[in-house]
Every structure is written in C-alpha cells, then in structure tokens.
C-alpha cells in the first residue's frame, strides 16, 4: 500500500512540477523593472524568455518577440535550452510513469518491468527538475550581475542637470514559479525512485532446508522473504503441513499480476 501511495504521490507531485515548469517557461515575467528608484513610473517593463513587454499606466500593454536567434545573449539561449530540456524530459517521464503506475493494469506487465519504468521516470523527473532549477538560477544570476552593473552607472548626466535613469531589472514571478516547480519535480522524481525499490522483486530466494521430526512431518521454512506490497497471498513464510520435505520453489507464490488498488 505504501509503495503504491508513494508512487502515486510522486506522479502527482511531478505532474504539478512539470506543469509549473511549462508555465514558468511561457511566462513573460522572468525579469521585471525595479521600481526602487522610480516608484512612480507610468511605464512598466518586464521580460520573458521569448519576448519583452511594456505596460503603460493607461492600461495598454505591448509585447515584442525576440525575432532573432543569433543576436540574443548566450546565457538566455542556455536558459531556454535548459527549460526546454526540462520540459521534454518531464513529459517523457510522465508518459513512462503513467504505464509504470501500480494501480494501472497494462496487459501482463511484470512488476519488475513496472519497477524499471518507475525508476526511469523518477530519474527523468530528477533531471527535469534539476534542469529547471539550473535554468532559473542561471537567469537569476544574470539578473543580479546586470543589476549591480547598472547600479554602478545609474545616472549619466549632462552637466549634472539632466538625469537619465537607467532601467534596472529584478526577479520576476516566473523565477519563483520555476524554482518551486523544479523543486516539486525533483521531489516527485525522488519519490518515484523510492517507490521503485518497493516494487522491485528481489531474486535472492534461499532454498528451504527440511527437518524431519520424528512425530509429524512438519517442514519449517526459513527466510526467503520478498519485498511485498501486502497484496495477494504470501505463503513464503507459512508452515507447510505435509508428509514430505519440499523446497521453497515448489510452493512459491508471487503476488497476483491483476491486483488493483
């Protein structure tokens, strides 16, 4: 039960995380105009990975796409790449994890196959989350660097009379969405990996040794425990009351392939 819950929760958390990564990637507010030195501006600037926007206090907003690839900063291209890789890996991970879910029956898929798929999707989620966190962090670092550079030459004057205020940019909402979403995807991936351990059948089954008692023929079966989900019959650690000695292989019962949660 715990394994199924962990797997299901991991899937849901990852799903929310990837939705957040997609939302963050599409958002225009990666960087927003810093209003500290000009809180009364009638024009507000903000920028995303794909376009920059200007919102006038009159309510009109104008957005312009970055219609060039070569003219964009390498860092911005890198952030775009990281976010897209994160989304692609996350999407593939979601697809794989749907088939890996223990509560979903697909043909005669073995638990070992489901365990492998769960692990694969978990790793994909972890990498996806790391890509998103890395992308957002690189962009944030770029903002911090540019912020202090523009602070250094904040005012350029003509004879000290005319002021030209340079626009500074600070963290936008998309950065926080990206960090949280990346974190959730990462957590979801870890949960999937944990769930995988519970799903994987252990192959180290020990042969049972039979002891013949003088009275009744009772075979005591030691060890040979498998990780069990608690579903289906499990006779591996029961006493076998019969007349002869038997190895465990003869009575081994695997959990049913057709269990539902």
């Amino acid at each position: 039960m715990a394994v199924t819950a962990c797997q299901g929760l991991g899937f849901v958390v990852s799903l929310i995380g990837i939705a957040g990564i997609i939302a963050a990637t599409c958002m225009d507010q990666w960087s927003t105009q810093d209003l500290y030195n000009n809180p009364v501006t009638a024009v507000f600037n903000y920028q995303g990975l794909w376009r920059s926007c200007v919102r006038e206090s009159s309510g009109f907003t104008e957005c312009r796409g970055y219609f060039t690839l070569l003219g964009l900063p390498a860092m911005l291209q890198a952030v775009r790449a990281l976010m897209i890789v994160g989304i692609v890996l996350g999407a593939i991970g979601l697809l794989v994890s749907i088939f890996a879910l223990k509560c979903i029956r697909i043909g005669s898929m073995e638990d070992s196959a489901k365990a492998n798929m769960t692990l694969t999707s978990g790793i994909m989620f972890i990498v996806s989350g790391l890509c998103a966190i890395a992308g957002v962090s690189v962009f944030a670092n770029m903002l911090v660097t540019n912020f202090w550079m523009s602070t250094a030459n904040m005012y350029t004057g003509m004879g000290g009379m005319v002021q030209t205020v340079q626009t500074r940019y600070t963290f936008g909402a998309a950065l926080f969405v990206g960090w949280v979403a990346g974190g959730l995807t990462l957590i979801g991936g870890v949960m999937m990996c944990i769930a995988c351990r519970g799903l994987a059948p252990e192959e180290t089954n020990y042969k049972a040794v039979s002891y013949h008692a003088s009275g009744h023929s009772v075979a005591y079966k030691p060890g040979g425990f498998k990780a069990s989900t608690g579903f289906g019959s499990n006779t591996k650690n029961k006493k076998i009351y019969d007349g002869g000695a038997r190895t465990e292989d003869e009575v081994q019962s695997y959990p049913s392939k057709h269990d539902y949660v």
Epitope: A42, V43, S52, V54, S57, S58, G59, F60, V162
Partner: antibody
Framework: QVQLVQSGAEVKKPGASVKVSCKAS????????MNWVRQAPGQRLEWMGQ????????KYNGNFKGRVTITRDTSASTAYMELSSLRSEDTAVYYC???????????WGQGTLVTVSS | DIVMTQSPDSLAVSLGERATINCKSS????????????LTWYQQKPGQPPKLLIY???TRDSGVPDRFSGSGSGTDFTLTISSVQAEDVAVYYC?????????FGGGTKVEIK
C-alpha cells in the same frame, strides 16, 4: 463617438468644497482611466489625479496634499472630482480627460470653471 | 517631479511658413523597454479644451494633419508645423507621460505674423 460632458460652472467661498462631475459616453467607461486636469488663468495645465472605473483604483498628484478625491459611478458612467479646503488659487477651469495609449489624454471634457471668491 | 520647459513662449510666423516649438525635460523620457519616448503634444485653441496631436514623441493621432510632426529623444523634443495655416493659431503644450505626476510644459503661443 466618445463624449465627456462636465457639470456647470461653480462659485465657491474659500474653505468650502466643490464636486465636479464628468459623464462619459460612446465607449466602455470601465475600461479606461479617467483623469482630472486643471488650468488656472495664465497658468500651465496641471494634472490632479486619475481613477480606473473598473475597480476604483486611484492615483493622485501629491502637490494637492490630499485635498483631491476622485470617485466614480459606473452605473451612470460618471466620474467625480472633489476638491476641498478651497483657496483663491484654486480658481481654474477643471477638465476630465480619458487616458489612452502612450499615457496621453485623447478625449477631453468641455471644462468646468470653478471660481473661489469671498 | 519632471520639469518640462518649452521655448519660445510665443512664436509669430507667416502663413505657409515653418514653425518649430522646443520642449526640454529635466529627465529622460525614453523608455528602454520599447525604445519609445513618452512625450505628448497638445494644441489648445482659445475657449476650448486641449486636443491631442502627437504621442510617443512622433506618432500622430488619427485625424491630425500631416503638417504636424514630432521629433526628438531622451530630453530634447521638437514639434514642427511644416506650413502654418490660419487654423493653427493656438497654444501648444508638451507633456511628460513617463513618470507620475504627469506634468505639462508652460505652453508656446503660435500667432500669424
């Protein structure tokens, strides 16, 4: 077509208050900021403040030290500007004006002359 | 507050001549986000409210004759009437549309010589 019709001229005593109305027609009143601008005789135009009828959000010119209150009645498509503690320097023509792209005033009311005299 | 300074205070031109009005702001009105200058020009005839002529320093409002043109960037702006007509007699104001409070220039009166 867009029209902004203001209330009639007023004569007030110093210390009193005046409330000028501006009825809008020909456009979606709730979707555009409404501004108030005044022009004292021989003086430059002076922006007083603005209101967004959609949610009642307001911005004011601090030079009026809280004497200006701008309100609206969306059902009547009307904006109001109240100026309190009137002084003789407040004698001016008061205009309402719609805020448009480029943060400019594209349509203006005909103006309301407010005379402050003892 | 941004201070808007217009020059000259008044201007007398002959019909058909060019008229040039200058406006200087105490702070740059250029927005880096869209490379637009937030400066507006208005025309006010006697007994009438102001009328919008040009916004974004150089964009003519609909219905404004093309003899009116705006230019300039940053802190220095110009309104040019290429061929003055009798109906252009008015006071012309520039306005800062970049920072609150929105401020106006002192006005330039255009008359016919």
């Amino acid at each position: 077509q867009v029209q902004l019709v203001q209330s009639g001229a007023e004569v007030k005593k110093p210390g009193a208050s005046v409330k000028v109305s501006c009825k809008a027609s020909g456009y979606a009143f709730s979707n555009y900021w409404m501004n108030w601008v005044r022009q004292a005789p021989g003086q430059r135009l002076e922006w007083m403040g603005q209101i967004y009828p959609g949610n009642g959000d307001t911005k004011y010119n601090g030079n009026f030290k809280g004497r200006v209150t701008i309100t609206r009645d969306t059902s009547a498509s009307t904006a109001y500007m109240e100026l309190s503690s009137l002084r003789s320097e407040d004698t001016a023509v008061y205009y309402c004006a719609r805020y448009y792209r480029g943060n400019c005033f594209d349509y203006w009311g005909q103006g309301t002359l407010v005379t402050v005299s003892s | 507050d941004i201070v808007m300074t217009q020059s000259p205070d008044s201007l007398a031109v002959s019909l058909g001549e060019r008229a040039t009005i200058n406006c200087k702001s105490s702070q740059s009105l250029l927005n880096s986000g869209n490379q637009k200058n937030y400066l507006t020009w208005y025309q006010q005839k006697p007994g009438q409210p102001p009328k919008l002529l040009i916004y974004w320093a150089s964009t003519r409002d609909s219905g404004v004759p093309d003899r009116f043109s705006g230019s300039g960037s940053g802190t220095d702006f110009t309104l040019t009437i290429s061929s003055v007509q009798a109906e252009d007699v008015a006071v012309y104001y520039c306005q800062n549309a970049y920072t609150y409070p929105l401020t106006f220039g002192g006005g330039t009166k255009v008359e016919i010589k």
